[in-house]
């Protein structure tokens, strides 16, 4: 198992719109029709004011109006819920579809896309029903913006909730070579398909993606637990032939100074098809982006049952070294390196100030409140409540696979 890596099944808490843990001051909008439809009235299941946030301008055709929620700290947002306008049960305004944008630092904004690059999310069919959208992939964000859409000039209004958990890993971004394609009976695409940073000259930097989404790959890398995805979806992989150095180098940036105990790398070892665990790992540490790498690198040779073809988490001890940046080299021991997840076990060093775009003033990581009850959905057919961290007897959502 991946110690220290978050469990997506336990990252489905209501983040505080409905129960007001998120204060009014953290909810804003591009515009509002009136004070009674201001951003603060956008809480799910709330009937405050005129029963929702409604923008002043038309959302057709420009789609520039937005509702913004500031979570104050980085969170993994796994689901969102939307509703139309309450208005004492007389509201008729809702949004049939919307887009999401998110930011970790308030400066760079990314558009959320599903696994196939689709940005538009199906919304509500009526003003009262709650429609829940399971975000696959989830987004690591401090700020989230909802952009309602319409196919003609019409009024749209919105109430929302976000679901997820605090991003306690502290990982802000990783830099890695672009994943490659393996050719078997079909092409196996080992690229990081959800990476939200930049890609220049075969290098991805400044973002997060599949190596930090909580989803570990299966023993057979051609298979995935995601519906209708391409072969290799869960893994990011590199061919030994492309790296004359004999290793793949990655860099990891964290929110603040941390003492690193270990790195967990979930690797494929289906050696019959060329995938091998790394032969060894070497990591270097530094406290700032312009600083020198400190001390000797930590080196770790991998032993164990390399003949066992099952995928597994490899633990790399990091000896409590203090840093905000890590650079790790993963040595090839076969034709391919395939990783599905990388996580870190670390402790924040006391009194270290957060990096720009990192963590923010203290906020509780525990779930702020109970989930709302009863909702209807286009995408999901619910049975009971909206999701919370999975426990025996907690609700299950039926899914439509078409």
């Amino acid at each position: 198992d991946m110690k220290g890596h978050f469990d997506p099944a336990k990252c489905r808490y209501a983040l505080g719109m409905q129960d007001r843990t998120i204060p009014d001051s953290d909810i804003s909008a591009s515009s509002s029709w009136s004070d009674s439809t201001a951003a603060r009235h956008s809480r799910l299941e709330s009937s405050d004011g005129d029963g929702a946030w409604c923008p002043a301008g038309s959302v057709f055709p420009k789609e520039e109006e937005y509702l913004q929620v500031d979570l104050q700290r980085l969170h993994l947002v796994a689901l969102v819920g939307t509703q139309g306008r309450h208005a004492g049960g007389l509201g008729k305004e809702f949004s049939r579809s919307y887009r999401l944008r998110y930011s970790r630092d308030g400066r760079r904004w990314m558009g959320w896309k599903d696994r196939w690059g689709q940005e538009v999310i199906s919304g509500n069919e009526d003003p009262e029903g709650v429609v829940l959208k399971d975000l696959g992939p989830p987004m690591v964000a401090r700020l989230v913006r909802f952009y309602p859409r319409a196919d003609r000039v019409m009024s749209v209004c919105l109430r929302v909730e976000l679901y997820g958990c605090l991003w306690r890993d502290g990982l802000l971004s990783y830099t890695a070579p672009v994943g490659q394609t393996m050719y078997l009976s079909e092409a196996v695409y080992l690229n990081d398909s959800t990476y939200d940073g930049h890609t220049v000259g075969g290098l991805q930097y400044g973002g997060l993606g599949q190596l930090a989404d909580g989803v570990v790959g299966l023993d057979d890398f051609r298979k995935s637990q995601e519906l209708r995805v391409w072969p290799g979806y869960d893994y990011v992989g590199w061919s030994n032939h492309s790296f004359s150095s004999g290793y793949v180098e990655m860099e990891f940036e964290f929110d603040r100074l941390r003492a690193f105990q270990a790195m967990q790398v979930h690797c494929n070892n289906m050696h019959t098809l060329g995938a091998r665990l790394p032969g060894g790992v070497e990591c270097r540490f530094r406290r700032g982006p312009a600083m020198a790498w400190e001390g000797e690198p930590m080196r770790h040779n991998l032993g164990g049952n390399l003949g066992d073809p099952r995928a597994r988490a490899v633990s790399v001890p990091l000896g409590g070294r203090v840093a905000r940046f890590l650079q790790c080299r993963f040595l090839f021991a076969g034709p391919w390196l395939l990783f599905s997840e990388i996580s870190f076990i670390s402790d924040v060093v006391n009194n270290s100030s957060p990096a720009l775009g990192g963590t923010f003033p203290p906020a509780p990581w525990w779930p702020p409140g109970p989930p709302p009850t009863n909702f209807s959905s286009l995408e999901l057919e619910p049975r009971g409540q909206q999701p919370v961290a999975k426990a025996e007897g907690s609700p299950t959502i039926e899914f439509r696979m078409d």
């Epitope: 489905r12 399971d134 057979d220 637990q225 209708r228 391409w230």
Partner: antibody
């Protein structure tokens, strides 16, 4: 070695209920979607329930929706199928299978447990 | 629902000869460049066993004499040089659109 062992079949009257369980071993149960598939006496195969790896998402065809409930306990590596309001057409061998929710079909199957619905 | 029609319903092949089984879908089972069609083998008294997934990928541990091909609505399972151990019923299954459906099966016998 991957193993799936079903238990809980038997003879039941129309309108009755039955609960199966499937004990999984030899793989990381919590990483895989799981399914129940039945094979009718005429040898036709029908997928009757799917659950994703975390247990949050389920799927049922119309033929069993509202009567069957799939669930899982990842701590116990066990899959369940609760069947109620049983009909004679539910008579079949019920197999627990790994996969179904995914992009590759079902790659391991249990030996199956037999259900006969008859008065 | 997507209906899968297998042909022939039964097939008798001499040892060492090639067996070809067809599966036709009532609508395309392709999405995003992949064919979500899978093939299973079921021997008498045993559960089904995955042979081929996504039209052409051979499952780990399956002999190389089994192969799959096809796209959209027409798919083929081929057994090169049939052996006595291949006597079984073969099923196709699609997982592109719910409800996921199986073909009616093709029974392979030795001539």
């Amino acid at each position: 070695e991957v193993q799936l062992v079903e238990s809980g079949g038997g003879l039941v009257q129309p309108g009755g209920s039955l609960k199966f369980s499937c004990a999984a071993s030899g793989f990381t149960f919590s990483s895989y979607g799981m399914s129940w598939v039945r094979q009718t006496p005429d040898k036709r195969l029908e997928l009757v329930a799917i659950i994703n790896s975390h247990g949050f998402s389920t799927y049922y065809p119309d033929s069993v929706k509202g009567r069957f409930t799939i669930s899982r306990d990842n701590a116990k590596n066990t899959l369940y199928l609760q069947m109620s309001s049983l009909k004679s057409e539910d008579t079949a061998i019920y197999y627990c299978a790994r996969g179904g929710y995914g992009n590759y079909g079902m790659d391991y199957w249990g030996q199956g447990t037999s259900v006969t619905v008859s008065s | 629902d997507i209906v899968l029609t297998q042909s022939p319903a039964s097939l008798a092949v001499s040892l060492g000869q090639r067996a070809t089984i067809s599966c036709r879908a009532s609508e395309s089972v392709d999405s995003y460049g992949n064919s979500f069609m899978h093939w299973y083998q079921q021997k008498v008294g045993q559960p089904p066993k995955l042979l081929i997934f996504r039209a052409s990928n051979i499952e780990s541990g399956i002999p190389a004499r089994f192969s799959g091909s096809g796209s959209r609505t027409d798919f083929t399972l081929t057994i090169n040089s049939v052996e006595a151990d291949d006597v079984a019923t073969y099923y196709c299954q699609q997982s592109n659109e719910a409800p996921y459906t199986f073909g009616g099966g093709t029974k392979l016998e030795i001539k």
